[in-house]
C-alpha cells in the first residue's frame, strides 16, 4: 500500500538561499551542521540531477547505519526537490520505498514555507510503524534547523547575488551572481 | 529559558500614535516570526501581523494595513508595533507572540496595556 | 480570512465534571490549530497545537481532536485551575485566526 503524511513547517531564512543551501548543497553541509545525525553523504552515481543515487551514512549509535537516495526532479524554478529512500534504513522486508517531495514556497516577509510529503510504498498489507514516521520527520527537523542556524549566523553565505562596486567593475554598480562573480575575478 | 518582556503602559489621545517593545530572550532571537496579538477589555483575541526577525519583511491583517508597523532591533533582541491614528476602539492589551517553527504560539509576553482616550 | 466558531461561549461546570468546547472552522484547515488557556490579567499559554498535541507540562486531563472543519478541546476531569476562557487557533498556511473564546466558570 501507499501510506502519505503531510506536513509544513516555516523559516525566517528566504526561500531561494534556503533552497540553495539546504537542497543543492545539503550534502555537503549536513555533516557540517549536524555531525550527530549524518557522518557523511556520498555520491555513487549521478551529477545531482535526476537519477543520481546518494549514500547518506549516519553516526554510530542512531538505529540504521546508512540509506541511499535516489535523486528525482530537482526544480531550481520552483524551488522542488522530489527523492526517493530505496535502500538501507527501514527499507526492507515490509518497505520497498519512501518517495519526499519539498517545496520551498516564499512568504511576503522574506522568509519560507516548507511543504513536505512522505509517501510510504509498503510491501502487500503492511502499515507504516509510526515511530518510524516520527523519527523521519524529527531527522528532517534536525537538519533543516541546523542548515537555518548556519545560515543566520553566516550572513554571506549561500546568498543569490553579490553587490560589486564601481571601482572592481569599471562601471555602474549592479547586482551579478557568484558565478558571474567567480567569473570576473579570475580574468 | 524563553522570555518575552514588553514595554509598560502607554496612554493615548485619539489620533495619536503609539510604539510598544518586546524584548527577547533565551533563544536566538532572528530564528523565530514574532506576532502582536491583541485583546480588547472583555473580548477575544485579535491577529495582528508579524515580523521575520531576520529579514525585517512584515506580513499584517488586513484591517491594520496602512495604519501598523513593525520593525526590529536584532542587536538588542528587541521588535517593535507602532499603531498611529489611534482610536478609542484601540484600547487594548497588545501582545507579542513567539511563532514556533509550525505556526502555533509557543511563547507570549506579558502585555502591553494602551488606553485612548480624550 | 478563515472565520473560527467557538461553542459554548460560557459554560458552567463543577470540579469533576468532564468539559467539551468546540470549535468550527469556515473553511479546512487540515490539523493546524491550537487550543490556548488564559485567566484574567495574564497572556493565553499555549495547551494544544496541531488539533491533538499536547504541550509539554500540561495535565493529561486535556486532550484534542478533529481535523478539517470540526475541532474539541475536552477536559476530563475540571480542577480548581482549569477556570478560565478557552481559545481555539487556526493557523492554516499563512493566516491566523481566534475564535472567540469559552469562559469556563463556577456552577
Known amino acids: 500500500g501507499v501510506f502519505n503524511y503531510e506536513t509544513e513547517t516555516t523559516s525566517v531564512i528566504p526561500a531561494a538561499r534556503l533552497f540553495k543551501a539546504f537542497i543543492l548543497d545539503g550534502d555537503n553541509l549536513f555533516p557540517k551542521v549536524a555531525p550527530q545525525a549524518i557522518s557523511s553523504v556520498e555520491n555513487i552515481e549521478g551529477n545531482g540531477g535526476p537519477g543520481t543515487i546518494k549514500k547518506i551514512s549516519f553516526p554510530e549509535g542512531l538505529p540504521f547505519k546508512y540509506v541511499k537516495d535516489r535523486v528525482d526532479e530537482v526544480d531550481h524554478t520552483n524551488f522542488k526537490y522530489n527523492y526517493a529512500v530505496i535502500e538501507g534504513g527501514p527499507i526492507g522486508d515490509t518497505l520497498e520505498k519512501i518517495s519526499n517531495e519539498i517545496k520551498i514556497v516564499a512568504t511576503p516577509d522574506g522568509g519560507s514555507i516548507l511543504k513536505i510529503s512522505n509517501k510510504y510504498h509498503t510491501k502487500g498489507d503492511h502499515e507504516v510503524k509510526a515511530e518510524q514516521v516520527k523519527a523521519s520527520k524529527e531527522m528532517g527537523e534536525t537538519l533543516l534547523r541546523a542548515v537555518e542556524s548556519y545560515l543566520l549566523a553566516h550572513s554571506d553565505a549561500y546568498n543569490e547575488q553579490k553587490l560589486i562596486s564601481e571601482e572592481d567593475l569599471g562601471g555602474e554598480q549592479k547586482l551579478i551572481s557568484e558565478e558571474d562573480l567567480h567569473h570576473h575575478h579570475h580574468h | 529559558q524563553v522570555q518575552l518582556v514588553q514595554s509598560g503602559a502607554e496612554v493615548r489621545k485619539p489620533g495619536a500614535s503609539v510604539k510598544v517593545s518586546c524584548k527577547a530572550s533565551g533563544y536566538t532571537f532572528t530564528g523565530y516570526y514574532l506576532h502582536w496579538v491583541r485583546q480588547a477589555p472583555g473580548q477575544g483575541l485579535e491577529w495582528m501581523g508579524l515580523i521575520n526577525p531576520n529579514t525585517g519583511g512584515t506580513n499584517f491583517a488586513q484591517k491594520f494595513q496602512g495604519r501598523v508597523t513593525m520593525t526590529r532591533d536584532s542587536s538588542i533582541s528587541a521588535a517593535y508595533m507602532e499603531l498611529s491614528r489611534l482610536r478609542s476602539d484601540d484600547t487594548a492589551v497588545y501582545y507579542c507572540?513567539?511563532?514556533?517553527?509550525?505556526?502555533?504560539?509557543?511563547?507570549w509576553g506579558q502585555g502591553t496595556l494602551v488606553t485612548v482616550s480624550s | 480570512d478563515i472565520q473560527m466558531t467557538q461553542s459554548p461561549s460560557t459554560l458552567s461546570a463543577s470540579v469533576g465534571d468532564r468539559v467539551t468546547i468546540t470549535c468550527r472552522a469556515s473553511?479546512?484547515?487540515?490539523?493546524?490549530l491550537a487550543w490556548y488557556q488564559q485567566k484574567p490579567g495574564k497572556a493565553p499559554k499555549l495547551l494544544i497545537q496541531e488539533a491533538s498535541s499536547i504541550e509539554s507540562g500540561v495535565p493529561s486531563r486535556f486532550s484534542g481532536s478533529g481535523s478539517g472543519t470540526e475541532f474539541t478541546l475536552i477536559v476530563s476531569s475540571l480542577q480548581p485551575d482549569d477556570f478560565a476562557t478557552y481559545y481555539c487557533q487556526q493557523y492554516n498556511s499563512y493566516s491566523w485566526t481566534f475564535g472567540h473564546g469559552t469562559k469556563v466558570e463556577i456552577k
Open positions: 507572540a513567539r511563532q514556533h517553527w509550525n505556526r502555533y504560539f509557543d511563547n
Open positions: 473553511q479546512s484547515v487540515g490539523n493546524w
